[in-house]
Structures are given as structure tokens and as C-alpha cells.
Amino acid sequence: GTIETTGNISAKKGGSVILQCHLSSTMAQVTQVNWEQHDHSLLAIRNAELGWHIYPAFKDRVAPGPGLGLTLQSLTMNDTGEYFCTYHTYPDGTYRGRIFLEVLESSVAEHSARFQIP
């Protein structure tokens, strides 16, 4: 299996950004997707049957989706850093993808460079 992510992305301070991962090249069943921040704190969990769980610190500015992705709103400079999606699958096990988000002071158009993690 392969995780494809939105790669390195930029977004404006005060704006919002969509963090997206996609698992391909496997027939494994996705049981859960975990979203974690650069300091290894948890943002959200998406359980395949029950749906979303949002970590308390992010309840006011994280919107689940689209899909298995996550929308982070009201961005601050402190949001700059790595984000990880962890796919828990059966029977394959765990797949992990990385996204780097840069929050910019000035108005810069979002840039998305897609890359793959085998």
C-alpha cells in the first residue's frame, strides 16, 4: 500500500487548510485514521464505524473532513510544522503519511506539492 498526501503546503495566518491523505494500492480495510501534530499531540481520530473524535484542544477550530481528511481553521504561526496521518488497516497494519504546513504572515497563495511515501 501507498499513502499519498498533500505534501508541503502553505496557508495564510487566520485562514484554513485541508490536510489530506489517501491510501492506495491495497485492498486492506481501513479501521481507523489518526491525525497527529508535530509535537505528537493528537488532533483527531476517525473510526471507520463510529466516525470522528476531536481532541479537546482543537474542538474550536478543527472540522472533520472532507472524507478522511481534516480542516484546520483560524491558523496561527504556531501551527507551522509536521502533521501525520496514521492509517490503521486490516490485515496490513499501519501506514503513516507526513504533511508539512507552513503558516505565512503575508498573503501567499496555497501551494500543494503531492508526493508519495511507500
Partner: antibody
């Protein structure tokens, strides 16, 4: 105050089905997430499954082939059925609520913990 | 499955003592941990969520700490009404419970 109360037969024969009812007052089962948990002799506890505010279900993989959780919103009750029971299913069965949180996108999300429980009902599987 | 191990299984203490109960996860669960109190013949009572957040209405002598794999429930100043079994539960991946710690008075 949310209250839950389990009811059902205390004795079930091996190979038969165990059927329990959880009656809820103080909260609508059409909101939040509602679960069944059992405690075996010796204190080991096991999450069995949930029924959600929308009526969809999630089951412990170890029980998936034998378990069914349903509900009756008009009576504010939800139900557990466990098929083909053995003596290993002897336990105290409890129902509980897992609260929800409404997100920015008006989506109901689960909180993970159980904030209200029933007192539990002891079920013995024996011939 | 994530295994949750509680220690000790039995704890004897005196009224007023500071009591510490431990819960260990078999892998990191971040702070996705809850604590419950169950008295004999009663429904479990929800005490703490996210490892250290006290549920509304729970006395402040109860506190939780920890993250990752090691967690602690502390009762600072044990009261007679605190005699009960305490158990932890993770909700990082599925839902699993510890075996419980029974707290009794010396």
C-alpha cells in the same frame, strides 16, 4: 440526570441467545452513543459494542459474528442480543452512554469515555 | 488490542492518606484515558477524562496525570466514601479497560 437500567434473564442455557434491554431516562438515545460493556468473574472488562444516535452500530471484532445491538427510540431503549452463548459469556452486563460533541461542521463526534452507566445485571450461562 | 494494566490490584490506606493508583498501556495512547470509580453493587462513576480533566461534580481531591503509556490517579486525602474499585479505560484505539485497583481502609 441521565439514568440507565439493564434488564433481562439472569440465567441462559448454553447455545441459546442472551437478550438484554437498557432503559434510558434523562437523555434521548437519538443523540449520543450507547454501549454495552461486560465484566467477567475476576474483573476483566470488555467493550462489546455501540449503537449510535443515527442507529448505526459498531461491534467488538471478537464478538462480531454473535452480537446484535438494536434500539426502540419510541421507548428510549436499546437492546443487546448475543447468540450461541457458552459458559465463557457468564458476566455482569452493563449499558453506558458515550457522550457526543457537535463540531464546527455540525457533525456529531464521539468523546471516547462513558459518562453514565447502569448498575449492571448478572447473567449466568449454565445448563 | 491495546492492553491496560493496573497496579496495585489491592491498596490498603488510612483516612487522610495520599493514594496513588497506576495504569499502564501496552502502547502510546496519548492522553486518551478515563478513570472510573465503582462501589460494590453500584454503577461505575465517571471521574476523569483526557488523563487529567476532572468531570464536573467530582471532588478536587481526585486528580489524574500522565500521557503516552503511564498514567496515575491520585486521591489526596482519602475519605471513607472513597473505598471502591477504580479502573482505567483507553479510547485511543478501540475501547479497553484495566483490571482495576481495589482501595480499602486499613
Amino acid at each position: 440526570e441521565v439514568q440507565l437500567q439493564e434488564s433481562g434473564p439472569g440465567l441462559v442455557k448454553p447455545s441459546q441467545s442472551l437478550s438484554l434491554t437498557c432503559s434510558v431516562t434523562g437523555s434521548s438515545i437519538a443523540s449520543d452513543y450507547w454501549g454495552w460493556i461486560r465484566k467477567f468473574p475476576g474483573n476483566k472488562m470488555e467493550w462489546m459494542g455501540f449503537i449510535t444516535y443515527s442507529g448505526s452500530t459498531s461491534y467488538n471484532p471478537s464478538l462480531k459474528s454473535r452480537i446484535s445491538i438494536t434500539r426502540d427510540t419510541s421507548k428510549n431503549q436499546f437492546f443487546l442480543q448475543l447468540h450461541s452463548v457458552t459458559t465463557d459469556d457468564t458476566a455482569t452486563y452493563s449499558c453506558a452512554r458515550m457522550p457526543s460533541f457537535i463540531t464546527l461542521a455540525s457533525l456529531s463526534t464521539w468523546e471516547g469515555y462513558f459518562d453514565f452507566w447502569g448498575p449492571g445485571t448478572m447473567v449466568t450461562v449454565s445448563s | 488490542d491495546i492492553q491496560m494494566t493496573q497496579s496495585p490490584s489491592l491498596l490498603s490506606a488510612s483516612v487522610g492518606d495520599r493514594v496513588t493508583l497506576n495504569c499502564k498501556a501496552s502502547q502510546s495512547i496519548h492522553k486518551n484515558l478515563a478513570w472510573y470509580q465503582q462501589k460494590l453493587g453500584e454503577a461505575p462513576k465517571f471521574l476523569i477524562y483526557y488523563a487529567n480533566s476532572l468531570q464536573t461534580g467530582i471532588p478536587s481531591r481526585f486528580s489524574g496525570s500522565g500521557s503516552g503509556t503511564d498514567f496515575t490517579l491520585t486521591i489526596s486525602g482519602l475519605q471513607p466514601e472513597d473505598v471502591a474499585t477504580y479502573f482505567c479505560q483507553q479510547y485511543y484505539s478501540g475501547w479497553t479497560f484495566g483490571g482495576g485497583t481495589k482501595v480499602e481502609l486499613k
